[in-house]
Interface confidence: low
């Protein structure tokens, strides 16, 4: 029996379409596939950012694949051809690997890139990113922010910069249509007459950086002689009630501090008739069903009760 062999794919390359980290990996079929005309060959593709411990691996019949990468680091990828079992009498036949790399030649020293980049998606409506200028850069240095997510034809530049001392230190984004639950890519580059400025790349998903508004309309309701129900309403905005978790801080008579994390807009508190004063505040966060992460809102305005009225049915501010 002659050993069945197959060549690796040809012209394997990583192409940067200018989407700030979303790259195309593409290749051509191997040479001398004439023997396997009846077979649809497959390709096993492995890729990672240089320095990462783990490879991502996919098997595809296509001649291209797309994914997001961290352009602050290089990218390495390798691919080989796999012949399906029905073409090889059940034996596993694969080619040698074809390998390629890609990186953006860095300009400037690392200290010149922006520092402390921070992006918050306020109330799932308004994205704001802020940063500090690089270490030791001169006032003539200016930074520019570009962004892209799937659905945009090309990367867009920020049109509403936040400035300090004439330098861009942040960006207020416009309405971002259909931009959540997908990777959001940002590049902040810079220019200076004196020295080159290092670019920085960031990737996140908007639903994971949401900071909601605080809850509103805090009220007390007497449930029984020893129970008081604390209630509040979800903040105004597009976030549905099912997406919230809440944290409550309750202070009784300036001594006992109770904290609790709850899922609904109510909390029942055990009290005694001796309670003279009750105060509580609530904050909100997007929960595990709607995001993988999130930022707590600010605390709500404090709602307090003082005096005899605790024995009455409903207690409002």
């Amino acid at each position: 029996d002659t050993e069945i062999k197959v060549n690796p794919p040809q012209d394997f390359e990583i192409v940067d379409p200018g989407y700030l980290g979303y790259l195309y990996l593409q290749w051509q079929p191997p040479l001398s596939l004439d023997h396997f005309k009846e077979c649809t060959v497959e390709y096993e593709l492995k890729y990672r950012n240089i320095g990462s411990e783990t490879w991502k691996t996919i098997i595809t019949k296509n001649l291209h694949y797309k994914d997001g990468f961290d352009l602050n680091k290089g990218i390495e990828a390798k691919i080989h051809t796999l012949l399906p079992w029905q073409c090889t009498n059940g034996s596993e036949v694969q080619s040698s690997w074809a390998e390629t790399t890609y990186w953006i030649s860095p300009q400037g020293i690392p200290e010149t890139k922006v520092q402390d980049m921070d992006c918050v998606y306020y109330n799932w409506q308004y994205l704001l990113c802020s940063w500090k200028p690089g270490i030791g850069v001169l006032l003539d240095t200016n930074y520019n922010l570009f962004y892209w997510y799937e659905g945009l034809d090309h990367a867009l530049q920020c049109v509403d910069y936040i400035k300090a001392d004439g330098q861009n230190i942040g960006c207020r984004f416009p309405y971002l249509e259909a931009s959540d639950y997908k990777d959001f890519y940002i590049c902040v580059n810079g220019s200076s007459e004196n020295k080159p400025i290092r670019s920085s790349y960031f990737t996140f998903q908007l639903q994971n950086i949401v900071k909601p508004l605080p809850p509103v309309y805090l009220t007390f309701t007497r449930e029984s002689s020893c129970e008081i129900k604390l209630k509040w309403s979800i903040p105004l905005g597009p976030i549905p009630a099912r997406c919230f978790d809440y944290e409550i801080e309750i202070r009784e008579d300036d001594t006992t501090l109770v904290t609790a994390t709850v899922e609904n807009e109510t909390y029942t508190l055990k009290t005694t008739n001796e309670t003279r004063q009750l105060c509580f505040v609530v904050r909100s966060k997007v929960n595990i069903y709607c995001s993988d992460d999130g930022i707590w809102s600010e605390w709500s305005d404090k709602q307090c009760w003082e005096g005899e009225d605790l024995s009455k049915k409903t207690l409002l501010r």
Epitope: D245, T261, V262, E263, N287, I288, Y289, D292, D293, G294
Partner: antibody, heavy 119, light 107 residues
Framework: QVQLVQSGAEVAKPGASVKVSCKAS????????TQWIRQAPGQGLEGIGA????????SYNQKFKGRATLTADKSTSTVYMQLSSLRSEDTAVYYC????????????WGQGTLVTVSS | DIQMTQSPSSLSTSVGDRVTITCKAS??????VAWYQQKPGKSPKLLIY???YRYTGVPDRFSGSGSGTDFTFTISSLQPEDFATYSC?????????FGGGTKLEIK
């Protein structure tokens, strides 16, 4: 993406202890509860306890109080579950899982660690 | 602790069948019930939470209903990949407790 990667299978003798690790990635480790759940062969799932790495708060199933100890190492984003005074009925697959609050189900699970208690 | 009693413990069924599994809580758990799918040697996978909400990416053939103490999980048309064990869990109080599981087997 969120990942929980557990340590490998363990064999222990009755009366001994075992320590299983669960390394988290892809989210803010200190912001979410990590729950430990076990499954004996052919049996249902059973909660052991949970830890909140942000402040090392723990919540134990009464059945495991005193025998299970949950700890978290923020520097490595790793949670540990130590079970002592092992007996044969502790033979099970032990899972770590991520919730948000204590009263949430678990969308993210580790791959499981088989602990076999045998003399 | 709240007990979750699941039935049946096993079910022989065929591709295309409608499958219904029930879970009964030992006390009122409002709508705080989740359902998981588990295949041999694999971790459980969350399908339904809060009795009737499908988790992200779960096909709409899976559904859940119920409140109080009685809960139902339904697969409207069984697919080959659905043969697995399904478990309910109450997420109303600590500790979380699970039903004993229902194993779907090919008839």
């Amino acid at each position: 993406q969120v990942q929980l990667v557990q340590s490998g299978a363990e064999v222990a003798k009755p009366g001994a202890s075992v320590k299983v690790s669960c390394k988290a990635s892809g989210y803010t480790f200190t912001s979410y509860w990590t729950q430990w759940i076990r499954q004996a062969p052919g049996q249902g799932l059973e909660g052991i306890g949970a830890i909140y790495p942000g402040d090392d708060d723990t919540s134990y199933n009464q059945k495991f109080k005193g025998r299970a100890t949950l700890t978290a190492d923020k520097s490595t984003s790793t949670v540990y579950m130590q079970l002592s005074s092992l007996r044969s009925e502790d033979t099970a697959v032990y899972y770590c899982a991520r919730g948000a609050t204590l009263l949430r189900p678990f969308p993210y699970w580790g791959q499981g660690t088989l602990v076999t208690v045998s003399s | 602790d709240i007990q979750m009693t699941q039935s049946p413990s096993s079910l022989s069924t065929s591709v295309g069948d409608r499958v219904t599994i029930t879970c009964k809580a030992s006390q009122d758990v409002s709508t705080a019930v989740a359902w998981y799918q588990q295949k041999p040697g694999k971790s459980p996978k969350l399908l339904i939470y809060s009795a009737s909400y499908r988790y992200t990416g779960v096909p709409d053939r899976f559904s859940g209903s119920g409140s109080g103490t009685d809960f139902t999980f339904t697969i409207s048309s069984l697919q080959p990949e659905d043969f697995a064990t399904y478990s309910c869990q109450q997420h109303y109080s600590i500790p979380p407790t699970f039903g004993g599981g229902t194993k779907l087997e090919i008839k």
